[in-house]
C-alpha cells in the first residue's frame, strides 16, 4: 500500500537509510510531502519482519520504486491504494 | 491513558506450566502497526526479550525459548497471553508486559506494565 | 543474534560527576538501539532512542553517542534521581537484545 499523507506534525524521520529494500520485503509505504512543520520529503516504509526505516527520497531505488507504483496506478490493473488525508 | 497490567501465578514448581496475561488499555492491538510483547528480570539482573505479537498475529520469539514459549492475544479484549512451558528455577523472573507501536520515530517498548514477580521453586 | 557488551556493570559516583555508559555491538545496528533507564522497584523507562535522540520529557543532562560499533550515554552532570540501572537495546534484528545492565550508585 502507498500512502500520501498531508499532516500538520514535526519531521517523523530522526535518521534515513539509502539501502536497498526488495519489493518483496515492503508491506507499506508512506510519503510525508515537504511543508506542514517539516522542511523535507519524508518516505517512511513498512516491511514485513515488523521493521520500519526511513528512507532517503533521493535514493534511486526508491524513486524508480514510486515511478513504478504511479504508473500502475493510473493502468487499470489492480493498484496499490493512494490515501491523501488533508486536515 | 496507555497502560499495562501483567497477572500470572506467584509461585509455581518445576515442569509446570507458567501462564501470564496481560490486559492494557490506553490503545487497541487492532490498528496497522501495534504489538505487544513480554520481556522478563531475574532478580538483579538484566533484561531478556521474549516474545511479541503485532495486530495481524505475526508472532516473534527469542530462539533460545523459541520451543517453549507461546504468544497469543484476545484483540476485542484488549489482553495478550504468555505461555512457558516446563519451567525451571531458571525462569524465575519479574516479567513485564510492554507495548511497540511501529510509528516513526520508533521506540519499541515504549509502554512498561508494573511487572509480575514469578518464582519457580519445589 | 546481536550481543550487546554493556560496561561497567557497575558504578558509583559523585552527585555533579559526568558519566558515561557504554554499549558495543557484535555487528552494525546502524543506530537502531535505546537507552532505558530503570529506577529501584520500577519500570524500566525509554530515554534515548535512535542512539541520540531524547525522549520526552528526558532532561537535558542525558545524551546519547555513537562512535562506529561503541554506542555510549553520557549524563553530564549526576543528580541524585539519577541513581538508577541502565540497560541498552538493539532492535535492528530479531532477536532484540539488550546489554546486562549498568547499576549506577551514589559514591
Known amino acids: 500500500v502507498l500512502e500520501v499523507y498531508y499532516t500538520s506534525l514535526r519531521c517523523r524521520c530522526v535518521q534515513e537509510s539509502s539501502v536497498f529494500i526488495p519489493r518483496r520485503f515492503i508491506d507499506r509505504i508512506q510519503i510525508l510531502p515537504r511543508g506542514n512543520g517539516c522542511p523535507r520529503k519524508e518516505i517512511i516504509v513498512w516491511k514485513k519482519n515488523k521493521s520500519i526505516v526511513c528512507v532517503d527520497p533521493q535514493a534511486e531505488w526508491i524513486q524508480r520504486m514510486m515511478e513504478v507504483l504511479r504508473k500502475r496506478s493510473s493502468s487499470t490493473l489492480p493498484v496499490p491504494v493512494f490515501k491523501r488525508k488533508i486536515p | 491513558q496507555v497502560t499495562l497490567k501483567e497477572s500470572g501465578p506467584e509461585i509455581l514448581q518445576p515442569s509446570q506450566t507458567l501462564s501470564l496475561t496481560c490486559t492494557f488499555s490506553?490503545?487497541?492491538?487492532?490498528?496497522?502497526?501495534?504489538?505487544v510483547g513480554w520481556i522478563r528480570q531475574p532478580s538483579g539482573k538484566g533484561l531478556e526479550w521474549l516474545a511479541n505479537?503485532?495486530?495481524?498475529?505475526?508472532?516473534y520469539y527469542n530462539p533460545s525459548l523459541i520451543n517453549r514459549l507461546t504468544i497469543s492475544k484476545d484483540t476485542s479484549n484488549n489482553q495478550a497471553f504468555l505461555k512457558i512451558t516446563n519451567v525451571d528455577t531458571t525462569d524465575s523472573a519479574t516479567y513485564y508486559c510492554?507495548?511497540?507501536?511501529?510509528?516513526?520515530?520508533?521506540?519499541?517498548?515504549?509502554?512498561w506494565g508494573q511487572g509480575v514477580m514469578v518464582t519457580v521453586s519445589s | 543474534d546481536i550481543q550487546m557488551t554493556q560496561s561497567p556493570s557497575s558504578m558509583s559516583a559523585s552527585l555533579g560527576d559526568r558519566v558515561t555508559i557504554t554499549c558495543q555491538a557484535s555487528?552494525?545496528?546502524?543506530?537502531?538501539l535505546v537507552w532505558f533507564q530503570q529506577k529501584p522497584g520500577r519500570s524500566p523507562r525509554p530515554l534515548i532512542y535512535?542512539?541520540?535522540n531524547l525522549a520526552n520529557g528526558v532532561p537535558s543532562r542525558f545524551s546519547g553517542r555513537r562512535s562506529e560499533s561503541d554506542y555510549s550515554l553520557t549524563i553530564s552532570s549526576l543528580e541524585s534521581e539519577d541513581m538508577a540501572d541502565y540497560h541498552c537495546?538493539?532492535?535492528?534484528?530479531?532477536?532484540?537484545?539488550f546489554g546486562a545492565g549498568t547499576k549506577l550508585e551514589l559514591k
Open positions: 535512535y542512539a541520540t
Open positions: 555487528q552494525d545496528i546502524e543506530n537502531d
Open positions: 537495546l538493539q532492535f535492528k534484528q530479531y532477536p532484540y537484545t
Open positions: 510492554v507495548r511497540s507501536e511501529l510509528v516513526m520515530p520508533y521506540v519499541p517498548f515504549d509502554y
Open positions: 490506553g490503545f487497541s492491538l487492532s490498528p496497522y502497526g501495534m504489538g
Open positions: 505479537i503485532w495486530w495481524d498475529d505475526d508472532k
